[in-house]
């Protein structure tokens, strides 16, 4: 295979490589395919040491349109020469290729999180996997955004060590009986477009004074 030749290239596939729950997930979408494939096979090799294309075991004859490559793509420095083959039964419909360099191509999906509202603070529980590969840390920082009445405040908690295990952050000095919304995301060291989580909102319970004022009425 000549990796500089566009023989394999097919503009009818759109690829996306994402860090989802600290796992490298390659997903794809097809454009202008009259026949929808019944299954796919993903193959790759490393650009710096081109060998025969290797089939990704858990993505051979898969019906899914994504592939977990965490255990295959271990380096953020290598370029991975990737070929996606689409089949209908035994017939090969197409093959698309693309080279991926994780250090620059990766997008970062927000972690899962829960919020619990108290009178004047919110506990934000961010869920990280228990173990995260060192290569997949990516100089990321966690950002928690607090929104209320059109005002957005950014919190950048300092996480000791790497992002693994569950992490709790307290947004304090809040106003009772007020609606607050929270979003979390992972920010890269550069201006890469961030993917913010959907907002989770909570109406804080009223404080003591307003309760006593209510009962005095």
């Amino acid at each position: 295979i000549s990796y500089d030749s566009p023989d394999y290239t097919d503009e009818s596939c759109t690829f996306k490589i994402s860090l989802r729950n600290f796992r490298s997930i390659l997903s794809w979408e097809l454009k202008n395919h009259s026949i929808v494939p019944t299954h796919y096979t993903l193959l790759y090799t490393i650009m710096s040491k081109p060998e025969d294309l290797k089939v990704v075991k858990n993505c051979a004859n898969t019906t899914r349109s994504f592939c977990d490559l965490t255990d295959e793509w271990r380096s953020t420095h290598e370029a991975y020469v990737t070929v996606l083959e689409g089949f209908s039964g035994n017939t090969t419909l197409f093959s698309c290729s693309h080279n991926f360099w994780l250090a620059i191509d990766m997008s970062f999906e927000p972690p899962e999180f829960e919020i619990v509202g108290f009178t004047n603070h919110i506990n934000v529980m961010v869920k990280f996997p228990s173990i995260v590969e060192e290569e997949l840390q990516f100089d990321l920082s966690l950002v928690i955004e607090e929104q209320s009445e059109g005002i957005v405040k950014k919190h950048k908690p300092e996480i000791k060590g790497n992002m693994s295990g569950n992490f709790t952050y307290i947004i304090d000095k809040l106003i009772p009986n007020t609606n607050y919304c929270v979003s979390v995301y992972l920010e890269h060291s550069d201006e890469q477009a961030v993917i913010k989580s959907p907002l989770k909102c909570t109406l804080l319970p009223p404080g003591q004074e307003s309760e006593s004022a209510e009962s005095a009425k």
Epitope: H77, H98, W101, S189
Partner: antibody, heavy 117, light 112 residues
Framework: QVQLQQSGPELVRPGVSVKISCKGS????????MHWVKQSHAKSLEWIGV????????RYNQKFKGKATMTVDKSSSTAYMELARLTSEDSAIYYC??????????WGQGTSVTVSS | DIQMTQTPLTLSVTIGQPASISCKSS???????????LNWLLQRPGQSPKRLIY???KLDSGVPDRFTGSGSGTDFTLKISRVEAEDLGVYYC?????????FGGGTKLEIK
């Protein structure tokens, strides 16, 4: 064969901006990232940053943040770098360089930028 | 940022004689993936730089085997077994292990 064709020399006044281009040919443009490197007498070679030609993600050398802006036009297989608020310190030759992973392999012929009043 | 220090600044060599250039980094260039992203470039007079060696010792296609790269961690060497006239120019080492990528100051090889 792989070629990176850069735009011609620029003679510009201090304080203005300049946008230089780099057209890739002989390979699949979106399969390789594009870097920009500055070469000046004072500082030899300096890495400015890199852009993903497929996703347009960028990574800048902190020193050039606010000075350089990298963009890409996939349809014409062209990478661009704009340099803002030019001073005499920005007078240099600027190269675009292709890379697959952490290996810059092919270099453009360079674009000379001279800042002079 | 990682500092890359090259020595000597200038190297004056007779054709047919060996040459050696040293490159030292301020931090180890060994990555967690087990590879070392140390590379060498040659810039001939009036030309753009051209990649010679990548990953410490791998020769780019078309580079004669009189060039060898070696080293590990923070200390690296480029050797030319027998210098030829076409080898003159400025040699640069650069590292791609840590962002921002950084270059050595260059070593000018001139023919005696």
């Amino acid at each position: 064969q792989v070629q990176l064709q850069q735009s011609g020399p620029e003679l510009v006044r201090p304080g203005v901006s300049v946008k230089i281009s780099c057209k890739g040919s002989g390979y699949t443009f979106t399969d390789y990232a594009m870097h920009w490197v500055k070469q000046s007498h004072a500082k030899s070679l300096e890495w400015i940053g890199v852009i993903s030609t497929y996703y347009s993600n960028t990574r800048y050398n902190q020193k050039f943040k606010g000075k350089a802006t990298m963009t890409v036009d996939k349809s014409s297989s062209t990478a661009y770098m704009e340099l803002a608020r030019l001073t005499s310190e920005d007078s240099a030759i600027y190269y675009c360089v292709r890379s697959g992973g952490s290996n810059m392999d092919y270099w453009g012929q360079g674009t000379s930028v001279t800042v002079s009043s | 940022d990682i500092q890359m220090t090259q020595t000597p600044l200038t190297l004056s060599v007779t054709i047919g004689q060996p040459a050696s250039i040293s490159c030292k980094s301020s931090q180890s260039l060994l990555d967690s993936d087990g590879k070392t992203y140390l590379n060498w470039l040659l810039q001939r007079p009036g030309q753009s730089p051209k990649r010679l060696i990548y990953l410490v010792s791998k020769l780019d296609s078309g580079v004669p085997d009189r060039f060898t790269g070696s080293g590990s961690g923070t200390d690296f060497t480029l050797k030319i077994s027998r210098v030829e006239a076409e080898d003159l120019g400025v040699y640069y080492c650069w590292q791609g292990t840590h962002f921002p990528w950084t270059f050595g100051g260059g070593t000018k090889l001139e023919i005696k």
